[in-house]
Amino acid sequence: TPGPVRRSTSPPVALRELIEELSNITQDQKTSLCNSSMVWSVDLTAGGFCAALESLTNISSCNAIHRTQRILNGLCNQKASDVASSPPDTKIEVAQFISKLLNYSKQLFRYGH
C-alpha cells in the first residue's frame, strides 16, 4: 500500500502521547522489538516526524510499533514524497531507532520547537 495522504493532528497532545508510547516500548522490551528489524537511521533534526514515519513505515507487521506509526502519521502533515532530507546510508535496529526518536521527541517537547 502506498504512503498515506495525511491530515495533521494536534501537535502538543500527540507529541506527549508519542513520548509516552515510545517510553512504554523502550521499557517493555522483553524480547527483540519487531524481530530485530533494521530501519534507516534518518536525520530527525532535518526531516522530523515525516522522516521518522517514512523510516518506520518500512517495518512491516509489527504490532508493537503500530500506535507509534499512527501518532507519527498524525504529526506528519506532508506526503512522503515531500520529505526533503539527505538520504540515509546507515541502518540501525528498530529498538535503537525508537530510543533515538524518544530523545528527539523529548527535546522538541522540552524546548517547544
Partner: antibody
Framework: QVTLRESGPALVKPTQTLTLTCTVS????????VNWIRQPPGKALEWLAM???????VYNSALKSRLTISKDTSKNQVVLTMTNMDPVDTATYYC????????????WGQGSLVTVSS | DIVMTQSPDSLSVSLGERATINCRAS??????????MHWYQQKPGQPPKLLIY???NLESGVPDRFSGSGSGTDFTLTISSLQAEDVAVYYC?????????FGGGTKVEIK
C-alpha cells in the same frame, strides 16, 4: 509479489473441528500479518482472526471461544482451527494479508469453500 | 466492537451515472487525525479487492472514478461514472480498533 493460498477440507460434519491452512509466498511471516475472513453463500464478509508478524493475535469477539490461529514461520503457513462446526458455518473462508501501515488487507487468497453437513 | 452499517443494501445506477454508498460506524474510527476506514470491491466469484484505504486514498491501480470521503463515523464511497465492470458488492471495513469489522455490503447493479 505476495500470494496467499487457502487449503483444507471441502466438507466437515457438524460438531467436528475445521482446520484451514494459509500458505504465504513472497513474504516472511515474521514480518507479515495474516487475517482470516469468511463469507456464507450470498452473505457479507465476516472477519474472524489475525496474527501479526510479531506474534500478536486478535479474534472475532463472538467466535473467540471456537477459534485458534497460529503460524509456522519455517513453512510460511498460518493455521486457523474452528471447533464445534455447525451448518451455519458453511462459507467460503479467505485468508488475507496486510504487510505495511496502515494495515488494510491488500492481498487476498482465492478462498476455500467449506460445507458443514452430515 | 465497532458496528459498521452500510446503506443502501443495493443500488441500481445507469451507465455513466454517479453511485454513492454510505457507511456509518457505531463509534469514531479516527485516530491521530486519520480515519482507519477502508473500502473493498468484490466481483461475483472473486475474492474482495482493496479499493481505498484510510478513507480517501486510492489503492494503486484503482481507476480514479472511485473516491472516498468522510471522517469520524460517516463515510462515503463514490463512483463518479459507473462502468459495466463496476458491478460488484462493496464493503467498508475499520481497523481503528480490534477486532476488525466489516459493513454488511452494498450491491451495485446497472439500471
Amino acid at each position: 509479489q505476495v500470494t496467499l493460498r487457502e487449503s483444507g477440507p471441502a466438507l466437515v460434519k457438524p460438531t467436528q473441528t475445521l482446520t484451514l491452512t494459509c500458505t504465504v509466498s513472497g513474504a516472511s511471516l515474521s514480518a507479515y500479518s495474516v487475517n482470516w475472513i469468511r463469507q456464507p453463500p450470498g452473505k457479507a464478509l465476516e472477519w474472524l482472526a489475525m496474527i501479526w508478524g510479531d506474534g500478536k493475535i486478535v479474534y472475532n469477539s463472538a467466535l473467540k471461544s471456537r477459534l485458534t490461529i497460529s503460524k509456522d514461520t519455517s513453512k510460511n503457513q498460518v493455521v486457523l482451527t474452528m471447533t464445534n462446526m455447525d451448518p451455519v458455518d458453511t462459507a467460503t473462508y479467505y485468508c488475507a494479508g496486510d504487510g505495511y501501515f496502515p494495515y488494510a488487507m491488500d492481498n487476498w487468497g482465492q478462498g476455500s469453500l467449506v460445507t458443514v453437513s452430515s | 466492537d465497532i458496528v459498521m452499517t452500510q446503506s443502501p443494501d443495493s443500488l441500481s445506477v445507469s451507465l455513466g451515472e454517479r453511485a454513492t454508498i454510505n457507511c456509518r460506524a457505531s463509534k469514531s474510527v479516527d485516530s491521530y487525525g486519520n480515519s482507519y476506514m477502508h473500502w473493498y470491491q468484490q466481483k461475483p466469484g472473486q475474492p474482495p479487492k482493496l479499493l481505498i484505504y484510510l478513507a480517501s486514498n486510492l489503492e494503486s491501480g484503482v481507476p480514479d472514478r472511485f473516491s472516498g470521503s468522510g471522517s469520524g463515523t460517516d463515510f462515503t464511497l463514490t463512483i463518479s461514472s459507473l462502468q459495466a465492470e463496476d458491478v460488484a458488492v462493496y464493503y467498508c471495513q475499520q481497523n481503528n480498533e480490534d477486532p476488525r469489522t466489516f459493513g454488511g455490503g452494498t450491491k451495485v447493479e446497472i439500471k
